[in-house]
């Protein structure tokens, strides 16, 4: 190999060792049969040297700096070269490096010719190994810019006071150009300025000069955003921290097209803008830090272009203002993460204001719009409190538990409207009355309606779930001893057509003692399966529930256990069932843990079935289901 | 009104057996557990043997376990206990009792009815 | 088995006087205790169970009370009947186990 670097060049190659690999052999630059493991050679120089290995660039890198001047003379601008010409080069990995030392009032802009550049954070590289980093200068401080790979959205970044810029080749890579001109700007009296610009979708994640360590104390850097003014534009943080300012305060300033309030300032743990159209500013401004306790200041952050959808220019009303106790959450559905781009999702408010979730909450009128290439992938979720502080005046008050109209006429799908019921405590209890009888969900017989009703306890200490329940059943009413929550889930879109057959009315009535009763009228047609709360997991300990089962005069109902035995096993105390007759009050006691489950038996009357359960050794507990058949009666027997 | 009547004791010799009965009326007899509970003359209380109200469980104390079986038949609200290898120290007053059913109820049995008592007296 | 202690073994008390009788347990029984009654030559009585919770019929002038391992059955004002012999009972475990009785006798 030669190479000859002409007088005045301001060029130094360097080859040296590499990484040390475990190789057996050791390999040198053979010059005039010296064997040697570096080899620097400078302006006006020629050197012949050959390889002791077959494989150098398992053992050798090269670097070549040039140092260009701006400072006592005229800049070379344009287009740089790769001096020298990578086919006279041995093939090793090579990193060209240019230095440029400007006056503080100069600025430098490097301009990437396409593919533009993509930033990479630490611990990542690039896939066909071509690595460009870029460093600017603060007095005799050196700020690293970034990392960046091919195949991104940065085509332009403007210092002042100079650039270090290093291109990083495999020795594979036939790559023979630098990919980027220099040009002399007027100063931009910030640290830097990096220009990301979009042809169509897509998205960009940019970091802080320094990242991840701190951003230097005190100063400005900006990107500017080239978007087609036919998409749209959403920033979101991905990582920030912030430093101990002692002046000033930290903060993003934001240029957006059309605003009245240019520049709007927000904290970095505000929520940032969305839905912006066409080319826009963001700068990071630092602050005077503590001398003593610094911190650090820096940022991570993502840009996400993408077509408005039909939907993000319509302003949806959701009037809160009637309701208390309520708030109303937008968020994105859970669902697998695909490695392609993928479109944001944002909901919007007041149009400006975007993420990927969005809380509403009572007492305001709220409007929203969405910037959402495919709205099912958004979800609402509802939670409204019910609460009775003083018993004497909400005793036999009744309340409709229906979800808002403003709330259906959304254009994303309600997963839960959650209602959580509030009674005081030993002081009241509460029954729940649907507009059309209910199914209990079971193995055996589930609902297939698009939403159900999930019933559980709403007291923190009290693992207690009442079941699933939907329209089309038999059970008439619910009450339960105190706290609830009642959530109706959909599961279906057609939820929307069938919106008219949800509907419960709650009441708050006198305390009982029961955790549950069941209100039960079977119909002929239909085998009614019921079954114990918290199936699945047991019945709590010391748990009561009834079921109160109604039989017309001329039906004779059938109730049948689905096992022999309940299996549930009692550290303390016993658990029984009592069948009880409401005409005759006759009633039959099982003890659950000691005894086998009736047969099936018949009754001619009305019925009532009691569980009470032990205290159950674990593993070992308590979960029955049953069903009530009706059967018309062939004699008499009154 | 609850009524428990016991019958079947006597005297026997060491070794022998005895089967004790006990008629039940006034209640559900199968809603309800039963227990035998014994008192040796001028001595205190000892529970026996005690049966669920569908005869699936069965408790025995265990200076009679592998001797008395406790057993009941619903149909005829009678409860049993078949005492075999009976020995001096058997000799006592047996009562048949009823459970009390409390919600939630102790895992132990609650006695809330007794009979007059059977004496078995075991003497050579 | 958990063994049940009763003391004293005898009271001497005046008809319409207070009395106390203590039952003592040799580990917790939880609140799982009764109280019976036994006139001579009769049947047991249920006063208490849940160890605190009178049985139907039993007058108010018998309380019970305490939970763990110790317990106390109190009289408020002893009638003459009254002068009989009481057992307490664990029903916390098996084996069920009564105490060895405690006699209250007219001073």
């Known amino acids: 190999f030669e190479i000859a670097l002409p007088r005045e060049s301001n060029i130094t190659v360097l080859i040296k060792l590499g990484t040390p690999t475990l190789l057996a052999k050791p390999c040198y630059i053979v010059i005039s049969k010296r064997h040697i493991t570096m080899l620097s050679i400078k302006s006006g120089e020629r050197i012949v040297f050959t390889f002791s290995c077959q494989s150098p660039e398992n053992h050798f890198v090269i670097e070549i700096q040039k140092n260009i001047d701006c400072m006592s003379g005229p800049c070379p601008f344009g287009e740089v070269q790769l001096q020298p010409s990578t086919s006279l080069l041995p093939t090793l990995n090579r990193t060209f490096i240019w230095d440029v030392k400007a006056h503080k009032s100069i600025g430098l802009e490097l301009q990437f010719s396409i593919p533009r550049l993509r930033q990479i954070g630490p611990g990542e590289s690039c896939p066909d190994g071509v690595t460009h980093s870029i460093s600017g200068r603060i007095d005799a401080t050196v700020v690293r810019i970034g990392t960046f790979c091919s195949n991104g959205t940065v085509s332009r970044i403007k210092m002042q006071e100079g650039v270090k810029m290093a291109l990083h080749l495999p020795w594979f890579h036939p790559r023979n150009v630098s990919g980027f001109s220099i040009a002399n700007r007027s100063s931009i009296k910030r640290l830097c300025i990096i220009e990301s610009v979009f042809e169509g979708e897509g998205s960009a994640t940019l970091m802080s000069a320094n990242y991840p360590e701190g951003f230097p104390e005190d100063e400005l850097m900006t990107w500017q955003f080239v978007v087609p003014a036919h998409l749209r534009a959403s920033v979101s943080f991905l990582n920030f921290n912030l430093s101990n300012c002692e002046r000033k305060e930290e903060r993003v300033e934001y240029y957006i097209p059309g605003s009245t309030t240019n520049p709007e300032v927000f904290k970095l743990e505000d929520k940032q803008p969305g839905n912006m159209a066409g080319n826009f500013n963001l700068s990071l401004q630092g602050c005077d830090q503590d001398a003593q306790s610094p911190g650090i200041l820096r940022l991570q952050f993502q840009v996400l272009v993408q077509h408005p959808q039909n939907e993000s220019n319509k302003i949806y009303v959701v009037d809160l203002s009637n309701e208390r106790a309520m708030s109303l959450t937008i968020e994105p559905r859970p669902v697998k993460q695909s490695r392609k781009f993928v479109p944001g999702c944002f909901v919007c408010l007041e149009s400006r204001t975007c993420s990927s979730n969005l809380t509403l909450t009572s007492g305001s009128k709220h409007k929203i719009s969405f910037l959402c290439d495919d709205l099912t992938r958004l979800w609402m979720n509802v939670e409204k409190t019910i609460s009775c502080t003083d018993h004497r005046y909400c005793q036999r008050k009744s309340y409709s538990l229906q979800v808002p109209s403003d709330i259906l006429h959304l254009p994303v799908e309600l997963h839960d409207f959650s209602w959580k019921l509030l009674v005081p405590k030993d002081r009241l209890s509460l029954v729940l009355v649907p507009a059309q009888k209910l199914q209990q969900h079971t193995h055996e017989k589930p609902c297939n309606t698009s939403f159900s009703y999930l019933v559980a306890s709403a007291i923190p200490s009290q693992d207690l779930y009442f079941g699933s329940f939907c329209p089309g059943g038999s059970i008439k009413q619910i009450q339960v001893k105190q706290n609830i929550s009642v959530t109706l889930r959909t599961f279906a879109p057609s939820f929307q057509q069938e919106a008219s057959r949800q509907g419960l009315t709650v009441s708050f009535i006198p305390y009982f003692k029961e955790e549950g009763v069941f209100t039960v009228t079977p119909d002929t047609k239909s085998k009614v399966y019921l079954r114990t709360p918290n199936w699945d997991r047991g019945l709590p300990s010391l748990t009561s529930v009834s079921w109160n089962i109604s039989v017309p005069r001329d039906q004779v109902a059938c109730l049948t256990f689905f096992k022999e035995r309940s299996g549930v096993v009692c550290q303390t105390g016993r658990a029984f069932m009592i069948i009880q007759e409401q005409r005759t009050r006759a009633e039959e006691i099982f003890s659950l843990d000691e005894d086998v489950l009736p047969k099936p038996s018949f009754h001619h009357h009305s019925f009532w079935v009691n569980i009470s359960n032990c205290s159950p050794t674990s593993g070992k507990q308590l979960d029955l289901l049953f069903s009530v058949t009706l059967t018309p009666r062939t004699v008499d027997l009154t | 009104e609850v009524q428990l009547l016991e019958s079947g004791g006597g005297l026997v010799q060491p070794g022998g057996s005895l089967r004790l009965s006990c008629a039940a009326s006034?209640?559900?007899?199968?809603?309800?557990?039963m227990s035998w509970v014994r008192q040796a003359p001028g001595k205190g209380l000892e529970w026996v043997s005690a049966i669920s109200g569908r005869g699936g469980s069965t408790y025995y104390a265990d200076s009679v376990k592998g001797r008395f079986t406790i057993s009941r038949d619903n149909s005829k609200n009678t409860l049993y206990l078949q005492m075999n290898s009976l020995r001096a120290e058997d000799t006592a007053v047996y009562y048949c009792?009823?459970?009390?059913?409390?919600?939630?109820?102790?895992?132990?049995?609650?006695?809330?009815?007794w009979g007059q008592g059977a004496s078995v007296t075991v003497s050579s | 088995e958990i063994v049940m202690t009763q003391s004293p073994a005898t009271l001497s008390v005046s008809p319409g006087e207070r009395a106390t009788l203590s039952c003592r347990a040799s580990q917790s029984v939880s609140s799982n205790l009764a109280w019976y009654q036994q006139k001579p030559g009769q049947a047991p009585r249920l006063l208490i169970y849940g160890a605190s919770t009178r049985a139907t019929g039993i007058p108010a002038r018998f309380s019970g009370s305490g939970s763990g391992t110790e317990f106390t059955l109190t009289f408020s004002s002893l009638q003459s009947e009254d002068f009989v012999v009481y057992y307490c009972q664990q029903y916390n475990n098996w084996p069920l186990t009564f105490g060895q009785g405690t006699r209250l006798e007219i001073k």
């Open positions: 006034g209640f559900t007899f199968s809603n309800y557990a």
């Open positions: 009792a009823k459970d009390i059913v409390v919600v939630p109820a102790a895992k132990g049995y609650v006695m809330d009815a």
